[in-house]
Each structure stands twice: as C-alpha cells, then as structure tokens.
C-alpha cells in the first residue's frame, strides 16, 4: 500500500458517499494512510471547504484536483476527500421556512420561520402557522413561541 | 389544491425524441424543485433528474445524462422532460413529482398520473 | 450508487395484521444526525403515494396506522393494523446521496 510524510489533520470524510466521518488522521512513512483509502480510492490531502475532488481518487496515487461546488445550489463546510459536494438546503415554504442566509460553496442555507410562523424548538425543520385570537391577545406571536390569546368572556382593563 | 398533470400516453419509433409534459397547479410553481422518475413495464422506481425551475439549474442522474433533457415554462407552469435517441428499453411509465425539502431530506410529495413512452418499430 | 434492499419481495397478510416492512441500505444514508430515507406506497396503474418522510415524519393526511423509524442503514415501514386499501406495493428511497435510488418494492397482497 502506499505510504506518505507524517500528517496530522482535522478532516471530515464524506468519502464520495456523502457519509460524514469526522476524524484526525495521523500518518506516517511506512504506515497506511487510514482513513484515507476508501473503496480503493486513495487520496493523500482533503479539498478544502466549498471545493470536491473533481472525480474519485484511486489506487494509483494520481491526486485529482479540487473544484468549486456549484454556488448557491451546492457546498462542503469542512476539508473532504469527496468527488461530491453536499446539496444546499431548501427552506420549504410549506414547512413554514423561509431562507434567513443563502448557501455559499461553503455554509449550507440558513432557514427562519416565515412571518407569522413559529418554532419552539431549538433547531426548525418545521414552524407552525401562529394562532389566530378571536377575542384579542394577551402576548403577540414570535420565531419562538405561539401568540397567546384572550379567553372568551376575559376583560381587558 | 396542488396537482401536476402530464400529457397523454406516446408511442415513438426507434431513434425518434419525444417531449412530456408535466402542468403545475395549486401553488407557486417556482418555489418547488420538479423531480422525474421513471418505471419500467412491471419493474421498480427509477430517479432520473431534477430541475429548479426558479433558474432552471439542472441535477440528473449519470445515467440519464444525455438521454433526457429537463426544462421549465415558468408563464405556464409546466415542466418538459424531452427523451432522445429512443430505444425500446425506454419503454416506461415517466412521471413528474414535486420535490420537497425537510431540513436537507428531499423528498417528493405529489405525483403527475405518469405518462406511458412506448417505443416500438 | 446507495443500494436499497427491501425485505420481504412480497407477503400475503389479513386485514387486521400487523405488517413490517424492513429497507436495508448498502451504506448509511443518514448525515448530521438526520435519516435521508422515505416511503411510499404505490398501486396498480397509479403513481406513487408519499407515506412517511425522513424516515419517521407521517405526510398529512396519511393514516396513523402507518409509521417508520430506523437511522444508519435499516429502516423499518410498519402497518399496525391492515387495512384493505393498504394492499399495494411500498417502496423505500434514500435521498442521502445522488443519484437518489429506490428499493426494488415490496408488494402486500391478501392472503
């Protein structure tokens, strides 16, 4: 097997599968390159974020060079030794989202609930349209919580 | 409510093109990415490609490159998916769905009735 | 490509039964904590149906009977109690990677 100079790296493997391995990679002459060598594909130095191996790497030792994810549809946030970017999320209207920043070739969409949306939760797949009071509101609707209405009959002073 | 109807059944001869239509109703049309699929006589699904019809970006499956072409008519919401150099392997059933996103898992909610390609001398 | 291996090919079931629907991915289609895969149910000569969306979310209006759950590489489509519109063929999808693939089906008939 091949072997290489002593390296020692963060680096997120999304190994063409788009599987996420984080891990720190030590190697040294005479020993395997773990955790680089993935279905007979041997890579000796990730692409950098927003960029993918323009095709597989393979066993022998040719490096294939780095290019950019498709911007605005496409990313890689960390160092990969991928022949494939991530897809950028979509915020999907009908779960409520709207995008709060677009993907870059490196940084996935980031999403928010729509107007008059929320989500209790820490991270929203999902905001839920905010209630409707009949009879007036006690605490206007936010991104996090539901409006909280009047009861019926309740008097405002 | 949201629907996506396809253009009627087809019968091609071999080495012919021919172009499916899929029209789009009941929710803004370019907000939504459109995925083909197609379904060989008593066989499985098969994922051909998508396209954003917001700019029409295209994603096809490798296999389908160079076979099948996708594009949008935004003034009529309807989606194309044009087949080429037809062969009687692309006898299938095609259909158009609406692409769906929950927090990266696309996924494909609603379904044209599917159009049937036949190729036959 | 993602291989989907449903299991069974086919089954024979009785309205009323409990029916398990297993998808076995040839690798993991989940990332960052999330399942990239989904169900749906199809019947002769109509298109598919959405059941079940990133492997345990119930589409709406989509009975309660039917549920998922799984992560990593096996997932699991259950019917708690079959009902005689359920007898179709179900197949799972993984959206983790392109090209997107689909198991080969899983066909309920009655038995």
């Known amino acids: 097997r091949l072997s290489s100079k002593s390296v020692n790296a963060q680096v997120t493997d999304i190994n063409s599968k788009g599987l996420e391995l984080r891990k720190t990679v030590t190697t040294v002459e005479t020993q395997n390159l773990e955790g680089l060598h993935h279905d007979g594909q041997f890579c000796h130095k990730p692409c950098p974020p927003g960029e993918r191996k323009a095709r597989d790497c393979t066993v022998n030792g040719d490096e294939p060079d780095c290019v950019p994810c498709q911007e605005g549809k496409e990313y890689t946030d960390k160092a990969h030794f991928s022949s494939k970017c991530r897809r950028c999320r979509l915020c999907d209207e009908g779960h409520g989202l709207e995008v709060e920043i677009n993907c870059t070739r490196t940084q996935n969409t980031k999403c928010r609930c729509k107007p008059n949306f929320f989500c209790n939760s820490t991270v929203c797949e999902h905001c839920d349209p905010c209630t409707k009071c009949e009879h007036g509101i006690i605490k206007e609707c936010t991104l996090t919580s539901n409006t909280k209405c009047k009861e019926e009959g309740s008097r405002s002073n | 409510q949201v629907q996506l109807v396809q253009s009627g059944a087809e019968v091609k001869k071999p080495g012919a093109s021919v172009k499916v239509s899929c029209k789009a109703s009941g929710y803004t049309f370019t907000s939504y990415w459109m995925q083909w699929v197609r379904q060989a006589p008593g066989q499985g699904l098969e994922w051909m490609g998508e396209?954003?019809?917001?700019?029409?970006?295209?994603n096809y499956n490798q296999k389908f490159k160079g076979k099948a072409t996708l594009t949008v008519d935004t003034s009529t919401s309807t989606a194309y998916m044009e087949l080429s150099s037809l062969r009687s392997e692309d006898t299938a059933v095609y259909y158009c769905?609406?692409?769906?996103?929950?927090?990266?898992?696309?996924?494909?909610?609603?379904w044209g009735q599917g159009t049937l390609v036949t190729v036959s001398s | 490509d993602i291989v989907l291996t449903q299991s069974p090919s086919s089954l024979s079931a009785s309205v009323g039964d409990r029916v398990t629907i297993t998808c076995k991915a040839s690798q993991s289609v989940d990332y960052d904590g999330d399942s990239y895969m989904n169900w749906y149910q199809q019947k002769p000569g109509k298109a598919p149906k959405l059941l079940i969306y990133?492997?345990?979310n119930l589409e709406s209006g989509i009975p309660s009977r039917f549920s998922g759950s799984g992560s990593g590489t096996d997932f699991t489509l259950t019917i708690s109690s079959l009902q005689p519109e359920d007898f179709a063929t179900y197949y799972c999808q993984q959206s983790n990677e392109d090209p997107r693939t689909f198991g080969q089906g899983t066909k309920v008939e009655i038995k």
């Open positions: 769905a609406r692409n769906r996103d929950y927090s990266n898992n696309w996924y494909f909610d609603v």
């Open positions: 990133a492997a345990s």
């Open positions: 396209i954003d019809p917001s700019d029409s970006y295209t």
